[in-house]
């Protein structure tokens, strides 16, 4: 016996289909109608048939009560080949839904997606993360799904993208945008950022995630966000190979004063990093391969420091720098 | 047998910020249900503040919304409760709670705010 | 928001008499054919604890006394024969759309 494909636990809270099967049933997806956080994983299948048994260019005003029903507050679809028409009529369904974050992962949109119609209502995701996710339309992607979004989103995640740059004109401004989250895509590169980080489209973010995005310096990252326009309170750059000393010939960087958060971590560094802001919060230069305890000079002022998880500390060492959280136990870097 | 326990201090200065720790037992935080923080000022009724989902998805009243965060440590089977600038009003009996049918509560810890 | 409004605020009754406690909701906390809408009782000084979930399925280890019923917007928690230690406040919940809210409290004691 097949085992069923969609699960629903006993509160009604997380429902999660897998569809493995040639010819699935899709029908029993709808024993996830009464979840909260609903999963459906369509095993690879494409879905270009489906345009055959639905009315894409249905007024989805008629599904708007049946919609409403849903408690469906976070959604994931993933491995799936999707037509563009298909994810557009699926979003302007949602639309009148309550869903508020949205996964895509493992997805190969197909084709164009249509503009949003003059009476369409947008979706009014506060997060949208995706990955894996390639699409036909190359770099005018994020303009073209963009368009189908109520301007409030407030978290934004692209990993594994084959292609994170934007087309930046396209792209129309995130106002609420508080959370870029970039990490996992190690061909992004300092250069690439700058492509992504499309210039004053990204006025509000506070945190800003480039974990294994290829970034080499801590000042090639300084000059990136500088060119764009963005001012981030946090920013993530552990797992990367980071190199300690700049390129001489380079400009010298000033960071916003707003960066109070730096995550170092996990960079490969043998040294404190030139470049660094003046003052900090909070700085994590934790599983690096230290060989020292850094220099006062060498470190900005900052209240939270972590280096645990360094070659130089050996539990029980007096801590290297006031104000610093080391554990004196070294963590599995 | 899942079990929930409250920790944190039992008097907040007035304008601080209110922080509280639930630690779970008999069941993992992110492999399944919400994780809630639900309170209950003297001789009043319920109020839910918010929750935490196994996928780390929060969701929070409105009416504290600007107030509050709910965050997690998976590693110790915790999550945790943050409320700022808080007044009198504030003062309550915090229960962390499981699912949004609470099925299993905390024995709540009162929490005073007052100079 | 949805407005849960318990009926009567405080009841005194007989120790074996039925008791019925209403709760109205501003809208209806139905998603398609499930209400989620629950019962709970507090002693002071304690949690709340789940009596009936779902409007009417009654929770693992509750006296059979307690049951539920209603749909939408109605619906009513009914103790068949009062005991002694049903002294305590009923609160009913909902959990259809968020914020998920609580009735203002019933207050049952007896007689």
């Known amino acids: 016996t097949t085992p069923e494909p969609c699960e629903l636990d006993d509160e009604d809270f997380r429902c999660v289909c897998n569809f493995s099967e040639p010819q699935p049933d899709w029908s029993e997806a709808f024993q996830c109608v009464s979840a909260v956080e609903v999963e459906i994983h369509a095993g690879g299948l494409n879905l270009e048939p489906f345009l055959k048994r639905v009315d894409a260019d249905a007024d989805p005003r008629q599904y708007a009560d049946t919609v409403k029903a849903l408690r469906v507050r976070r959604l994931t679809v993933g491995a799936a080949q999707v037509p563009a028409q298909l994810l557009v009529g699926a979003l302007r369904v949602l639309a009148y839904s309550r869903l508020k974050e949205l996964t895509l992962e493992d997805l190969k949109i197909t084709g164009t997606m249509p503009p949003l119609p003059l009476e369409a209502t947008g979706l009014a995701l506060s997060s949208l993360r995706l990955r894996n996710v390639s699409w036909a339309t190359g770099r005018s992607w994020l303009a073209e799904l963009q368009q189908w979004l109520k301007p409030g989103l407030k978290v934004l995640s692209i990993a594994q993208a084959h292609s994170p740059a934007f087309s930046c004109e396209q792209v129309r401004a995130f106002p609420a945008l508080t959370s870029l989250d970039l990490s996992d895509n190690p061909g992004l590169g300092e250069r690439g950022l700058m492509a992504a980080l499309c210039p004053h489209k990204f006025p509000a973010i506070q945190n800003l995630a480039l974990r294994n995005t290829g970034m080499e310096t801590p000042t090639g990252v300084c000059a990136a966000l500088a060119a764009a326009g963005v001012q981030p309170h946090s920013l993530d750059l552990s797992h990367n190979s980071l190199r300690a000393t700049v390129n001489p010939s380079a400009p010298r960087c000033m960071w916003s004063s707003a960066l109070n958060s730096l995550n170092l971590s996990f960079a490969g560094l043998e040294q404190v990093p030139k470049g660094l802001p003046a003052k900090l919060r909070v700085l994590d230069l934790s599983c690096n391969r230290l060989n020292r305890a850094p220099q006062p000079d060498e470190l900005p002022e900052v209240d939270n420091l972590t280096l645990d998880g360094n070659p130089f500390l050996v539990p029980g060492t007096a801590l290297p720098h006031e104000g610093s959280m080391n554990s004196g136990v070294v963590p599995a870097c | 047998q899942l079990q929930l326990q409250e920790s944190g201090p039992g008097l907040v200065k007035p304008s601080e910020t209110l922080s509280l720790t639930c630690t779970v037992s008999?069941?993992?935080?992110?492999?399944?249900?919400?994780w809630n923080w639900i309170r209950q000022p003297p001789g009043k009724g319920l109020e839910w503040i918010g929750y935490?989902?196994?996928?780390?998805?929060?969701s929070y009243n409105p009416s504290l919304k600007s107030r509050v965060t709910i965050s997690r440590d998976t590693s110790k089977n915790q999550f945790s409760l943050k409320l700022s600038s808080v007044t009198a009003a504030d003062t309550a009996v915090y229960y962390c709670?499981?699912?949004?049918?609470?099925?299993?509560w905390g024995q709540g810890t009162l929490v005073t705010v007052s100079s | 928001d949805i407005q849960l409004t318990q009926s009567p605020s405080s009841l005194s009754a007989s120790v074996g008499d039925r008791v019925t406690i209403t709760c109205r909701a501003s809208?209806?906390?139905?998603?398609?054919?499930?209400?989620?809408l629950h019962w709970y009782q507090q002693k002071p000084g304690k949690a709340p604890k789940l009596l009936i979930y779902?409007?009417?399925n009654l929770q693992s280890g509750v006296p059979s006394r307690f049951s539920g019923s209603g749909s939408r917007t109605d619906f009513t928690l009914t103790i068949s024969s009062l005991q002694p230690e049903d002294v305590a406040t009923y609160y009913c919940?909902?959990?259809?759309?968020?914020?998920?809210?609580f009735g203002q409290g019933t207050k049952l004691e007896i007689k």
């Open positions: 709670v499981r699912g949004l049918r609470f099925a299993y």
């Open positions: 008999g069941g993992s935080i992110s492999s399944d249900s919400a």
């Open positions: 935490i989902s196994y996928s780390g998805s929060t």
């Open positions: 809208e209806s906390v139905d998603s398609y054919v499930t209400s989620f």
């Open positions: 779902r409007a009417s």
């Open positions: 919940q909902q959990s259809n759309e968020d914020p998920y809210t």
